[in-house]
């Protein structure tokens, strides 16, 4: 069986192309595709921000390349700043161990 | 329940903790710890490569502060690779659904 | 209200290096905007140089790749322009504008401009 | 690099007229088209973006259409200071990249 780490890799792969395939080019995240991603998937990081200026600021901020889509290296960019942002509230908290899966 | 993709990231978090506080600095990986890390919660993309050289090679491609330990944010950088490659694979077989979770 | 000034010398020598600087007021260097240089030559076509944006993120014009670099200072809400060995075919007007977050990332504000002659 | 074809380079035309102008990208831009227009001795002012998305301040004469590569600007009722010159950009893709401008002079 995989391992919990190798299972995490797999989902942000899968999770990408779940949305990516939807509209346009199936291997990037256009406007509505990355915002479909982030209301299901990760409802946690986005909280009430649901304005459209919000959105916008988000892809523009993720889209390195002007390209007006998010392709799976500025995706990964964008997991690594909230999983950075995950573990700088985690060391905050020296004492509180790892959740267990 | 928390979404895939939050688990996902929550996992990347608790893993590289559950090593990083064996040894030394407790928000770092040594040499030792990622050795440690590499063989248990990745073995797949560790494959055969076990031999000391490749530790070292690896470690140095890490390291980009050069301080001899890799930190969380090296850390997403390594693990944005691998999600990397494995993305190619995927992009490679575009009929390949992903793998239900 | 966003205000962009270029600022910079008039008349530069063929070979030598053309350096402008944009102030901004108005707005401070958010992760929102990127920070354009564009220019206009003589017979009025527009060319789009480069810009800096969010984390630093740069992307450059590749017909100027090797000849330019873009920088900024976000404590004095400056960023600069320098054009390495410079010919009169780099005589333009030189304009700084601001990249909003829109679709199609549209130049929403942008400096009066600054007219840069190369002449020996 | 995608090129961008304005049309015509020039008109002339008379206060209260419908003019329209065409700009033409060399592969599917996606609706990423943005249209400037600029006065004499001044810098460029945003007009509309994504097509036909206005931008702040902007008059309601002024109108965008389009898809793919074929995009038009439209002044419904040309007033006195709408003489200027017109620019379309694609927004698409780096590098960024501008059409050759559409004059428009008093009739």
């Known amino acids: 069986m995989a391992c919990p780490l190798e299972k995490a890799l797999d989902v942000m792969v899968s999770t990408f192309h779940k949305y990516s395939g939807k509209e346009g080019d199936k291997f990037k995240l256009n406007k509505s595709e990355l915002k479909e991603l982030l209301t299901r998937e990760l409802p946690s990081f986005l909280g009430k921000r649901t304005d459209e200026a919000a959105f916008q600021k988000l892809m523009s901020n993720l889209d390195s390349n002007r390209d007006n889509e998010v392709d799976f290296q500025e995706y990964c960019v964008f997991l690594s700043c909230i999983a950075m942002m995950c573990n700088e509230f985690f060391e905050g908290f020296p004492d509180k161990q790892p959740r267990k899966k | 329940m928390a979404c895939p993709l939050e688990k996902a990231l929550d996992v990347m978090v608790s893993t590289f903790h559950k090593y990083s506080g064996k040894e030394g600095d407790k928000f770092k990986l040594n040499k030792s710890e990622l050795k440690e890390l590499l063989t248990r919660e990745l073995p797949s993309f560790l494959g055969k490569r076990t031999d000391e050289a490749a530790f070292q090679k690896l470690m140095s491609n890490l390291d980009s502060n050069r301080d001899n330990e890799v930190d969380f944010q090296e850390y997403c950088v390594f693990l944005s690779c691998i999600a990397m490659m494995c993305n190619e694979f995927f992009e490679g077989f575009p009929d390949k659904q992903p793998r239900k979770k | 209200d966003v205000q962009l000034q270029e600022s910079g010398p008039g008349l530069v020598k063929p070979s030598q290096s053309l350096s402008l600087t944009c102030s901004v007021t108005g707005d401070s260097f958010t992760n929102d905007y990127y920070w354009n240089w564009i220019r206009q030559f003589p017979g009025s076509k527009l060319e789009w140089m480069g810009h800096?944006?969010?984390?630093?993120?740069?992307n450059y014009n590749p017909s100027l790749k090797n000849r330019i670099s873009i920088t900024r200072d976000t404590s004095k809400n400056q960023f600069f322009l320098r054009l390495t060995s410079v010919t009169t075919e780099d005589t333009a007007t030189y304009y700084c504008?601001?990249?909003?977050?829109?679709?199609?990332?549209?130049?929403?504000?942008w400096g009066q401009g600054t007219l840069v002659t190369v002449s020996a | 690099d995608i090129q961008m074809t304005q049309s015509p380079s020039s008109l002339s035309a008379s206060v209260g007229d419908r003019v329209t102008i065409t700009c033409r990208a060399s592969q599917d831009i996606r609706n990423y088209l943005n249209w400037y227009q600029q006065k004499p001795g001044k810098a460029p002012k945003l007009l509309l973006y994504y097509t036909s998305r206005l931008h702040s301040g902007v008059p309601s004469r002024f109108s965008g259409s389009g898809s793919g590569t074929d995009y038009t600007l439209t002044i419904s009722s040309l007033q006195p200071e709408d003489f200027a010159t017109y620019y379309c950009?694609?927004?698409?893709?780096?590098?960024?990249?501008f059409g050759g401008g559409t004059k428009v002079e008093i009739k």
């Open positions: 504008t601001r990249e909003s977050f829109y679709d199609g990332y549209p130049f929403d504000y």
């Open positions: 950009q694609q927004g698409n893709s780096l590098p960024r990249t």
């Open positions: 800096i944006g969010y984390g630093g993120n740069i």
